[in-house]
Interface confidence: medium
């Protein structure tokens, strides 16, 4: 246990610096604003749990090595563009629902132990906001998810396999967004 | 509440065809793995293959492939098992169950196919 | 495809008795499930995830294990109790296995 942390604590230094900027951004811009829907919102403790941290980071480590395509971010501040703080815990569940509809449960053999783990949690997440909805019109947030499904889908499994490597990212952004 | 309902009995000879449907309903269809499952009389379960009905994706037990087509209808909430060269070692109950995560929460009734010259 | 061994092949208890299935499993799983299945109905998924209870199911049944080594265990068996047995994998690609199962009689 003691060397997965090591090796996840390494993980998180190494490959997830690049999104330090990302989960500033969102730290900074006040990332537990009280949302539209006093339902999207996650307990903390769903976050403080080290052994599914690990294991979601572990699994979003062993997809990102088989990914190829280094160029293309899903999760990145363009998901973000023109979504107000309040709003961007009910953008982050329609980006969980599809990344659990999508990419998770059809690609539910690839990556174990870890994937079989991972998915009944974030599973979970995504049933405690299913009651999560924003006042008024959400096209402005539906036209930034559209834009990751679409890169997803254009990508085919090479696609999928993308957005398993950035379920760390997802999670935290969750993590900001929701709590 | 999670119901699959699944066509009747069958009788077939050996060579032939037959196509099995499987009517889900209380969920939402597409999200979940749809596997049918076989048990010959007197025997054990034997997997035969899944679907997920949101993308069409498709996985076979290797003993099976080329013989049998698992196909879903999203319209109608149907998932299908087509196979193909019935021999009479194929006669058993097939279920048709639904995914609960890793494990296979809800079963259809089962419909029995009977191989006979 | 990872193979699955249950024993006993069959047992046969009295009522109130602990009775305990083992399943073993080829090489490293997960998670293990367990179902019963009686005479003429479909099976029914009582354990999930090695050790939790599928909601409505009595405490009576528990399950626990890992790596290779999973236990099914009734703590008090009831004459309703009577059915087979079987544990199932979903860990090896693509595949998901079931043990032979393990039939249960009341003595």
């Known amino acids: 246990m003691a060397a997965l942390q090591k090796s996840v604590s390494s993980f998180l230094m190494g490959t997830l610096a690049t999104s330090c900027l990302l989960l500033l951004a969102l730290l900074v811009q006040g990332g537990a604003a009280a949302p539209i829907s006093s339902h999207c919102r996650l307990d903390k403790s769903n976050f403080q749990q080290p052994y599914i941290t690990n294991r979601t980071f572990m699994l979003a480590k062993e997809a990102s090595l088989a990914d190829n395509n280094t160029d293309v971010r899903l999760i990145g501040e363009k998901l973000f563009h023109g979504v107000s703080m309040s709003e961007r815990c009910y953008l982050m569940k329609q980006v969980l629902n599809f990344t659990l509809e999508e990419v998770l449960f059809p690609q539910s053999d690839r990556f174990q132990p870890y994937m079989q783990e991972v998915v009944p949690f974030l599973a979970r997440l995504s049933n405690r906001l299913s009651t999560c909805h924003i006042e008024g019109d959400d096209l402005h947030i539906q036209r930034n998810v559209q834009k990751l499904k679409d890169t997803v889908k254009k990508l085919g499994e090479s696609g999928e396999i993308k957005a398993i490597g950035e379920l760390d990212l997802l999670f935290m952004s969750l993590r900001n967004a929701c709590i | 509440q999670v119901q699959l309902v699944q066509s009747g009995a069958e009788v077939k000879k050996p060579g032939a065809s037959v196509k099995v449907s499987c009517k889900a309903s209380?969920?939402?269809?597409?999200?979940?793995?749809i596997h049918w499952i076989r048990q010959p009389p007197g025997k054990g379960l034997e997997w035969i293959g899944r679907i997920y009905p949101g993308t069409g994706r498709t996985y076979y037990n290797e003993k099976f492939k080329g013989r049998v087509t698992i196909s879903a209808d999203k319209s109608i909430s149907t998932a299908y098992l087509q196979w193909s060269s019935l021999k009479a070692s194929d006669t058993a109950m097939y279920y048709c169950a639904r995914s609960y995560d890793y494990s296979v929460a809800y079963w259809g009734q089962g419909t029995l196919v009977t191989v006979s010259s | 495809a990872i193979q699955l061994t249950q024993s006993p092949s069959s047992l046969s208890a009295s009522v109130g008795d602990r009775v305990t299935i083992t399943c073993s499993a080829s090489s490293s799983v997960s998670y293990m499930h367990w179902y019963l299945q009686k005479p003429g109905q479909s099976p029914q998924l009582l354990i999930y995830?090695?050790?939790k209870l599928l909601s409505g199911v009595p405490s009576r049944f528990s399950g626990s294990g890992s790596g290779t080594d999973f236990t099914f265990t009734i703590s008090s068996l009831e004459a309703e109790d009577a059915a087979t047995y079987y544990c199932?994998?979903?860990?090896?690609?693509?595949?998901?296995?079931f043990g032979q199962g393990t039939k249960v009689e009341i003595k």
């Open positions: 209380g969920y939402i269809f597409r999200s979940y793995w």
């Open positions: 995830e090695t050790s």
């Open positions: 199932q994998q979903w860990s090896s690609n693509p595949y998901i296995t």
